[in-house]
Amino acid sequence: PGPPPGSPRASPDPRAELDSTVLLTRSLLEDTRQLTIQLKDKFPADGDHNLDSLPTLAMSAGALGALQLPSVLTRLRADLLSYLRHVQWLRRAMGSSLKTLEPELGTLQTRLDRLLRRLQLLMSRLALPQLPPDPPAPPLAPPSSTWGGIRAAHAILGGLHLTLDWAVRGLLLLKTRL
């Protein structure tokens, strides 16, 4: 090996990576908010809706301060993978019923996938432990009715909104520790 010529800076610094991850998460949060408004407008639904297969909210915003970087990123990635799977399921199962939301749902899926890749890259750059993904979950059962699917859509978008809101706060807090 010859003398070190040095390399030009080829890719973003992890702190810059974290900044762009926060921006992407914020824009995804806004997409989800807009989509939730559209869904409520087109398919009004009273009260909160739950779906047993969705992840429970990772952490209250107040308890974020005690979290460590690896646990935040690992948990966030696991939860977002679950939401990605649910959005894919929703698009497949409810294609015709949610046709009016389709372009936006497709964009949401693409951006969610991009955010997951960004988180993985950030974990690689920091050399944080990347736990093996959970074993594949059993396939989600198709909704029992159109109304059941719409309730599921409300639950998925509502849960994703809360998770992304938590994610923005968590990532901003982590930035101060990097």
Epitope: S7, A10, R117, Q120, S124, L126, P133
Partner: antibody
Framework: EVQLLESGGGLVQPGGSLRLSCAAS????????MHWVRQAPGKGLEWVAV????????YYADSVKGRFTISRDNSKNTLYLQMNSLRAEDTAVYYC???????WGQGTLVTVSS | QSVLTQPPSASGTPGQRVTISCSGS?????????VHWYQQLPGTAPKLLIY???ERPSGVPDRFSGSKSGTSASLAISGLRSEDEADYYC???????????FGGGTKLTVL
């Protein structure tokens, strides 16, 4: 400009020890996980060890576990690899690398031979 | 034996397009971990060519592109040039090792 400069390689007898160093400049060293990757003569790349950006996580390839120790000093922008109980099969060019790895040093040759 | 599998050699004539494949196992590529590609010119250190399956670091020509589908990934080089003659390695995080694994490398010859 990013620079990673390895040093400390050389000829050592089987069973002996060496300590490799890697001096980093041109980037925020303390924000990057750091790796050691080696390449035996005429062979492919083999990952050796990794340490997280803050030194709290360290992982090793099975082939070096219990013999090699990776460490870092963020105040000095320096990465280390302490190699004990060296074997002939550890003969290789050892590269220090940052991030994915995104950046690589030019390597230092370690020869284990009697 | 490498954890990721690449063809040992590939070749093409100037101007041609060549593709190098990389396949993995359940603890790396199959688990959804991203694939990165490195170029190692003779006598030099490896250089990052593609990261996160398809992203190009600044300074890497757009003749180089990467893709990933399910259990494998591939690197494509279009408009082949003599200076592309090098060894190419794929890498991915491996959850059983808690570190990256490399393919065995593909020696590209420009005829």
């Amino acid at each position: 400009e990013v620079q990673l400069l390895e040093s400390g390689g050389g000829l050592v007898q089987p069973g002996g020890s060496l300590r490799l160093s890697c001096a980093a400049s041109g980037f925020t060293f303390s924000s990057y996980g750091m790796h050691w990757v080696r390449q035996a003569p005429g062979k492919g790349l083999e990952w050796v060890a990794v340490i997280s950006y803050d030194g709290s996580y360290k992982y090793y390839a099975d082939s070096v576990k219990g013999r090699f120790t990776i460490s870092r000093d963020n105040s000095k922008n320096t990465l280390y690899l302490q190699m004990n109980s060296l074997r002939a099969e550890d003969t290789a060019v050892y590269y220090c690398a940052a991030g994915v790895p995104d950046y690589w040093g030019q390597g230092t040759l370690v020869t284990v031979s009697s | 034996q490498s954890v990721l599998t690449q063809p040992p050699s590939a070749s093409g004539t100037p101007g041609q397009r060549v593709t190098i494949s990389c396949s993995g196992s359940s603890s790396n590529i199959w688990s959804g971990y991203d694939v990165h590609w490195y170029q190692q010119l003779p006598g030099t250190a490896p250089k990052l060519l593609i990261y996160s399956n398809e992203e190009r670091p600044s300074g890497v020509p757009d003749r180089f592109s990467g893709s990933k589908s399910g259990t494998s990934a591939s690197l494509a080089i279009s408009g082949l040039r003599s200076e592309d003659e090098a060894d190419y390695y794929c890498a991915a995080w491996d959850s059983s090792l808690y570190g990256p694994v490399f393919g065995g490398g593909t020696k590209l010859t420009v005829l």
